[in-house]
Amino acid sequence: QPTCDVSKVTSLLEVNCEDKKLKKLPTDLPADTGILHLSKNQLGTFSTSYLVHFTHLTHLYLSRCELTSLQAHEKLLKLETLDLSHNHLQSLPSLGRALPALTTLDVSFNKLGSLSPGALEGLGQLEELYLQNNDLKSLPPGLLMPTTKLLKLSLANNKLRELPPGLLDGLEDLDTLYLQGNWLSTIPKGFFGSLLLPFVFLHANTWYCDCEILYFRNWLQENPNRVYLWKEGVDVKAMTANVASVRCANLGNAPVYSYPGKGCPTNEGDIDYDDYADTPTTRTEVKFSTNTKAHTTYWGLFYSESSTSPDSQMTSLPPIHEPTKKQPTFAHTEIPGFTTLPDTMESNTAFYSLNNTVPTTTPEPTSTQATPEPSSTPMLTTPVPTPEPSSIPMLTVPVSTPEPSSTPMLTTPVSTPEPSSIPMPTIPVPTPEPSSIPMPTIPVPTPEPSSTPMPTIPVPTPEPSSTPMFTTPVPTPEPSSTPMLTTPTLTTPESSSTPSILVSTIPPVLTTTLAPPESIPKTVLEQFYTLEPTLPRTLESTIIIPEQNSLNSQAVPQASSDTPKSNPFLNSDFCCLLPLGFY
């Protein structure tokens, strides 16, 4: 019996040697093999010289082969598809001379830290290039100059802080660009040129909205139907455009497209199309905590196949998913044109949710199943995932308040006693003076700790008479199935086991589409501001009031008129009754 299974597809002999515990190439491979599957073996190293006699070979699949090195000295003149995903490659050799016919190259989920300028030299037929989920911190100028026929490019979930100007020059046929989940703060002026680019993914970056973002903002305004939010398992063509998924990290996650840009010089090419009224901004101090079980476990769900640790990829999110409905078992399903992701993860927008749903993920990997999603739970009942008390990170975000005289307090229950039970929000009460509130600064490990100091961002705040505070109480008793308002006692943070989040009711600066995150894995602002620990610029914070039409109509309290007092979303006193995830 031969080592591998043989079949034929579209006139090509297909040889399947997947998961055969091979440490080297089988000796009995058919000479006329056209498609060769070697995935899920333990090859360690691979060279094109192994296959030089396989003159019909057009597709070669080497994913999950524990590859640490690849050599491409011998020519495989007919090879069109090369899948090297989910390996341990730290560098990519020049493939152009050996593989001139290559049309699809997948090197996703490896450990590529950089690419040489000539890495793609000679790959003039390349149509699809997948580099997502690596450790790429920068790209060399002219990287894509040789690949003029490129249709699909994925650079998602890397550590890119900037993109080289002209990266896309000459890529006239490019139709899909994945840039989500990086550390990008802006897009170079003229970056998109005149490219049509029907599908672009830009969410989950640290976009910094200042005058330098105007080119990008204008491009978003002019191309709102080209910007999409990644949904796992959904074909790109079936997704709906979502330009609001691109958010300003420094402006309370306001959509970049609506950034006013007031006071910026109106240069040719990034004309300020919008004329918004001047709005005050406030400074926010964000202190990140790390090394918690809840933190690690949650990211573990996203990073099951990532080659780097969760903590080293603070913002490098994979395509965003819905909370898992059960504890994950990392079986994988192939997604055409994209690399595999755990199939327990459903598509979601945890980072930038535009729907309002109840989170269902328990961060701790216990045997208990995560809370099932109630069919029609009111919005006020959104529970926070249950971490262990000792593992809850402390996050302090003081914000200056215009009218701090009597700001309400929200106690959000952390524990959901039963899957069916619904927590009870408490009636707000005034909080004590801010001086009595502990605000520890817990440093976050940085990718390059030796060279990068950990700054704390100064917070110029007026002396408020009463600072608002959100606190998280101890687990609530078993509540009834309907939310009930109760009169609480004053709750103050007592130890670092409880996250205290200081936020204020700032008058709305922009009225834009921003609904609650669909899951709250750690604390809300830690998720929204999962930045590289050394923040490049001071974060500015504004509270954005969601538009009524952007929310799930079943879950939103309806108002009969749109006056501030009758519409709960326009009522400044109403803000703090909502669960923290709503903001």
Partner: antibody
């Protein structure tokens, strides 16, 4: 002209073995993939096995491990070794040629009947 | 495996009639790389071996009369005999040659009315 002539059919008991042959002429045998296709009495066509011009065999699950296809290019012959025969293997067995690397069958033999019965 | 379903299983027609036989596959037979649909049609007369009529959905084998034509894409295919001739009374089979195992439809028997 292309000719394919099958032989070796007959009556065999369940569990028994039989070897079919197909003599090819009128074309460069070594350059073509060859196949066996069968047709149970009064039924439709069912693919049994193929062998590429380079000699790589492949089979459907229904016969995998029981049937073995082979070729002898020097003799312009195709073979099908059938072991562990079952009643459901009863059929007319056709030898057929494939066009190039494609997998439709442009020439067929007249067929040989294999009957598996106790 | 790809399942092939032909309809009707039999039909009665007269000489000169236009006859249409359909074949459905359980998955697409379109190869996006070359835009070809991997479907073939055969004619078989009683006691004889099948004869190739059409491959790649619509390409007529040499020597096959022009009254035979094939069409379709993806999962739905049609064999049309524009004007039925006496020698066309036979059983017709479709076959997918997209991926092994190669599978055939159950056949459509065209009988004289």
């Amino acid at each position: 002209q292309v000719q394919l002539v099958e032989s070796g059919g007959g009556l065999v008991k369940p569990g028994g073995s039989l070897r079919l042959s197909c003599a090819a002429s009128g074309f460069t045998f070594s350059s073509f993939a060859m196949s066996w296709i069968r047709q149970a009495p009064g039924k439709g066509l069912e693919w049994v096995s193929s062998i590429t011009s380079a000699g790589t065999p492949y089979y459907p699950d229904s016969v995998l491990g029981r049937f073995t296809i082979s070729r002898d290019n020097a003799k312009n012959s195709l073979y099908l070794q059938m072991n562990s025969l079952r009643a459901e293997d009863t059929a007319v067995y056709y030898c057929a040629r494939s066009r190039g690397y494609e997998d439709y069958f442009d020439y067929w033999g007249q067929g040989t009947l294999v009957t598996v019965s106790s | 495996d790809i399942q092939m379903t032909q309809s009707p299983s039999s039909l009665s027609a007269s000489v000169g009639d236009r006859v249409t036989i359909t074949c459905k596959s359980s998955q697409s037979l379109l190869n996006s790389r070359n835009q070809k649909n991997y479907l073939a049609w055969y004619q078989q007369k009683p006691g004889k071996a099948p004869k190739l009529l059409i491959y790649f959905t619509s390409t007529r084998e040499s020597g096959v009369p022009s009254r035979f034509s094939g069409s379709g894409s993806g999962t739905d295919f049609t064999l049309t005999i524009s004007s039925l001739q006496p020698e066309d009374f036979a059983t017709y089979y479709c076959q997918q040659h997209y991926s092994s195992p190669w599978t055939f439809g159950q056949g459509t028997k065209v009988e004289i009315k």
